[in-house]
Interface confidence: low
C-alpha cells in the first residue's frame, strides 16, 4: 500500500514586538514532538503594523484596536483555524513604553490595558502584554541568536549549517539597537561581572552560562538624536542649528515642545527664547562624531572598566551578532559585508554625510525623506557607540557580524522570549530517543 502522509503535527506561537517606533508581529512554527530540541523553531511570517509605536497612542488609546487589526487578521489567515485556540500570543513592549512608564505609570498601564483588551478578542491563547525589562531584552536577544546559530545544540558539528558559524560552541555576543535603547549581551572570558545588575545566570540544555548584559535607555538611535539636538541647541546663538549630522542643504523645523517631550532630553532642558528652531545640515562626519561623543560620559567609572555613564563593561570576548537597527542602517549604507574594515566604514560614512541633500534625495527616490535624512546621523552614531561606547577597535571590528536573519528567522528578542515563555529551552539536556516519531505510516 502507498504511504500516506499524516496531518502535520505542528505548533505555532505569536509574539508582538511593541517597539518605540513601530510594532511587528512574528509568527513561529515548530514540530510538536520536538519541542525540546534546539533549533527547530522557525519564523514563518513577519507583519509590520502600520503606524508608530504603541506609546504614541497615549492620547488616543481607542485607536489601538484598529491599529493591531491588520496584522492580527494576517495571523488568523496564516495559522490553521484548528490551531487558533492553542496558539499563544505574547506582546512585549520595550524602551518606548519604559520611557512612557517613567513619565506616568498610569498612562503606560492604560495603553497596556487597551492592548490586552484588543488582543483578547482574537481566537488565540492570549498570554498577556507587558513591558519587558532592558535586561530581558538583552537576554532574549542573546538566546535568540545563539539558538538560531545552533550554539546550544548537544553535539559540535564538523560542517557548517548556518552563516557566521565558527564550528564551536562558543556563544555569540548580541548587540541590539532600537529606537529608544540599545543592548549589549555576551559571555565574558573568566571575568567576574562586577555589577550584579548586569549579571545573568542561565542553565540551558545542561550547560551553565554566566552572561553580562546591559540596556542603555535613551541610547537607541532616535532618542540619541533627540539627546544630541537638545544638547546642541543649548549653545546655539539663535534659532538656527547648523548640524554636521545632516546632509548639506537639508533643512527641518523642530518644535522645542517635541524636543523636551521625552525623558531622555531632561538633562539638557533649558528655557529657550524661541518655540521652534531650524536644523540646517552641514554634512561633516568628523564633527558629527565629536558631537555624539559628548553624549557618552566616560569621565566616571566605579569599576575596573566601563562602557559609558559609569556602567560596568567587561573586556569584549568572541564574535558578536549586531542586529535590529545596527543591521538595517548598515544594510542601507551597504556596509554589512564581512570584508569591510572599520577604517573603510569610516571612510564611506565621511563621503555619505558630505553628499548634498538634493543629490541624496535623487539617488534614493523610493525612501521616505524622514528616514533618509537620518542615515548620516544613524551610521555615525553606530560607529561612535561601537568604538567609543563599547570599546571595539579596528582589529576587533571583524568580530562584529551585522545580521538581519539567521536561517530565515529575524534576529531579535522575540524568538528567545517565546522559547522561554513556552518552556522550550530546557535547563537540562533532553534525553535523546533513538528514533523520532515518523510522519509516514
Amino acid at each position: 500500500t502507498q504511504n500516506k502522509a499524516l496531518p502535520e503535527n505542528v505548533k505555532y506561537g505569536i509574539v508582538l514586538d511593541a517597539g518605540s517606533s513601530h510594532t511587528s508581529l512574528y509568527i513561529y512554527k515548530w514540530p510538536a514532538e520536538k519541542e525540546n530540541d534546539t533549533g527547530v523553531v522557525h519564523q514563518v511570517e513577519e507583519c509590520r503594523v502600520k503606524g508608530p509605536g504603541i506609546s504614541k497612542f497615549v492620547q488616543k488609546v481607542n485607536e489601538i484596536g484598529i491599529y493591531l487589526t491588520d496584522c492580527m487578521e494576517r495571523a488568523r489567515e496564516v495559522i490553521p483555524r484548528s490551531q487558533h485556540q492553542e496558539t499563544p500570543v505574547y506582546l512585549g513592549a520595550t524602551a518606548g513604553m519604559r520611557l512612557l512608564r517613567m513619565e506616568s505609570e498610569e498612562l503606560a498601564d492604560r495603553v497596556l490595558d487597551v492592548v490586552e483588551r484588543s488582543l483578547s478578542n482574537y481566537p488565540f491563547d492570549f498570554q498577556g502584554a507587558r513591558i519587558i525589562t532592558g535586561q530581558e531584552e538583552g537576554a532574549y536577544g542573546w538566546i535568540t541568536i545563539n539558538y538560531l546559530l545552533g550554539k546550544f545544540s548537544q553535539k559540535t558539528r564538523w560542517f557548517s549549517i548556518v552563516p557566521y558559524e565558527t564550528n564551536n560552541q562558543e556563544t555569540f555576543g548580541a548587540l541590539d539597537l532600537g529606537g529608544a535603547s540599545t543592548q549589549v549581551t555576551f559571555v565574558p572570558q573568566n571575568q567576574t561581572i562586577e555589577s550584579p545588575d548586569n549579571a545573568l545566570q542561565f542553565r540551558l540544555y545542561g550547560k551553565d552560562y554566566n552572561v553580562y548584559t546591559h540596556s542603555f535607555l535613551c541610547y537607541g538611535k532616535d532618542q540619541a538624536l533627540w539627546q544630541k539636538l537638545a544638547k546642541d541647541i543649548q549653545v546655539a546663538s539663535n534659532e538656527i542649528l547648523r548640524d554636521p549630522c545632516f546632509h548639506p542643504g537639508y533643512k527641518k523645523v523642530v518644535n522645542v515642545s517635541d524636543l523636551y517631550k521625552t525623558p531622555c532630553t531632561k538633562r539638557f532642558e533649558m528655557t529657550l527664547p524661541f518655540q521652534q528652531f531650524e536644523i540646517q545640515g552641514i554634512g561633516n562626519y568628523q564633527q558629527c562624531h565629536q558631537s555624539i561623543l559628548e553624549l557618552f560620559n566616560t569621565s566616571y567609572c566605579p569599576y575596573s572598566q566601563c562602557a559609558f555613564n559609569g556602567i560596568f563593561l567587561p573586556p569584549l570576548q568572541g564574535d558578536f551578532g549586531a542586529f535590529s537597527a545596527f543591521y538595517f542602517v548598515m544594510k542601507f549604507l551597504n556596509l554589512t559585508s564581512e570584508k569591510v574594515s572599520q577604517e573603510k566604514v569610516t571612510e564611506m560614512m565621511k563621503k555619505f554625510c558630505a553628499q548634498p541633500w538634493e543629490e541624496i534625495k535623487t539617488s534614493y527616490a523610493g525612501v521616505k525623506e524622514k528616514y533618509l535624512s537620518e542615515y548620516c546621523f544613524s551610521g555615525t552614531y553606530i560607529l561612535s557607540l561601537l568604538l567609543q561606547g563599547y570599546h571595539f577597535t579596528a582589529d576587533s571590528w571583524e568580530h562584529i557580524h551585522f545580521i538581519g536573519k539567521i536561517q530565515g528567522s529575524d534576529a531579535g528578542w522575540t524568538l528567545g522570549y517565546m522559547l522561554n515563555l513556552t518552556n522550550m529551552i530546557p535547563a537540562e539536556q533532553p534525553l535523546s530517543t533513538p528514533l523520532s516519531h515518523s510522519t509516514y505510516v
Epitope: 505574547y90 490586552e116 498570554q127 498577556g128 502584554a129 507587558r130 530581558e136 537576554a139 532574549y140 538566546i143 545573568l200 542561565f202 542553565r203 540551558l204 522561554n420 515563555l421 518552556n423 522550550m424 529551552i425 530546557p426 535547563a427
Partner: nanobody
Framework: QVKLQESGGGLVQAGGSLRLSCTAS????????VGWFRQAPGKERAFVVA????????SYADSVKGRFTISRDSAKNTAYLQMNSLKPEDTALYYC?????????????????WGRGTQVTVSS
C-alpha cells in the same frame, strides 16, 4: 485550583539568613511563573522576586538584588526563596503566588493563586 503553602519563616537577627519554601498542590506547577511578595504592617503588598516557568529568567526588586535568590524544583513542585544578609526592613509577611499568564509579574494583580503567607521578622 492551585493551592500554595509557604513555610520557613521565623525570627532572625540582622545579617542572618532564611530559606522560604512554597509548595504547590498541583503537578502542573512548573507551567506557572512564581512570585514572592511581602507586606509590612500598614503597607501595600510589594513585589520581591519572580521566576519564569522555565527558570531561565528571574526578576528581583532593587531592594533585594544580590541578597535574595529564587529557585525552583519542578520535581518537588516547590519554589524557594533564599534570603541572605537580612535587614530589619525585610520584616514582613511573605506571600508566594502563582502566575499562569506570564504577564504583569511585578504587581499582585498579575497572579492567579496565593498562599496564606509566612512571617519573617528581622531583629536589630
Amino acid at each position: 485550583q492551585v493551592k500554595l503553602q509557604e513555610s520557613g519563616g521565623g525570627l532572625v537577627q540582622a545579617g542572618g539568613s532564611l530559606r522560604l519554601s512554597c509548595t504547590a498542590s498541583e503537578e502542573s506547577f512548573n507551567k506557572y511563573g512564581v512570585g514572592w511578595f511581602r507586606q509590612a504592617p500598614g503597607k501595600e503588598r510589594a513585589f520581591v522576586v519572580a521566576i519564569r516557568p522555565s527558570g531561565v529568567i528571574t526578576s528581583y526588586a532593587d531592594s533585594v538584588k544580590g541578597r535574595f535568590t529564587i529557585s525552583r524544583d519542578s520535581a518537588k513542585n516547590t519554589a524557594y526563596l533564599q534570603m541572605n544578609s537580612l535587614k530589619p526592613e525585610d520584616t514582613a509577611l511573605y506571600y508566594c503566588a502563582a502566575n499562569s499568564r506570564n504577564t504583569n509579574y511585578y504587581r499582585p494583580n498579575g497572579y492567579d493563586y496565593w498562599g496564606r503567607g509566612t512571617q519573617v521578622t528581622v531583629s536589630s
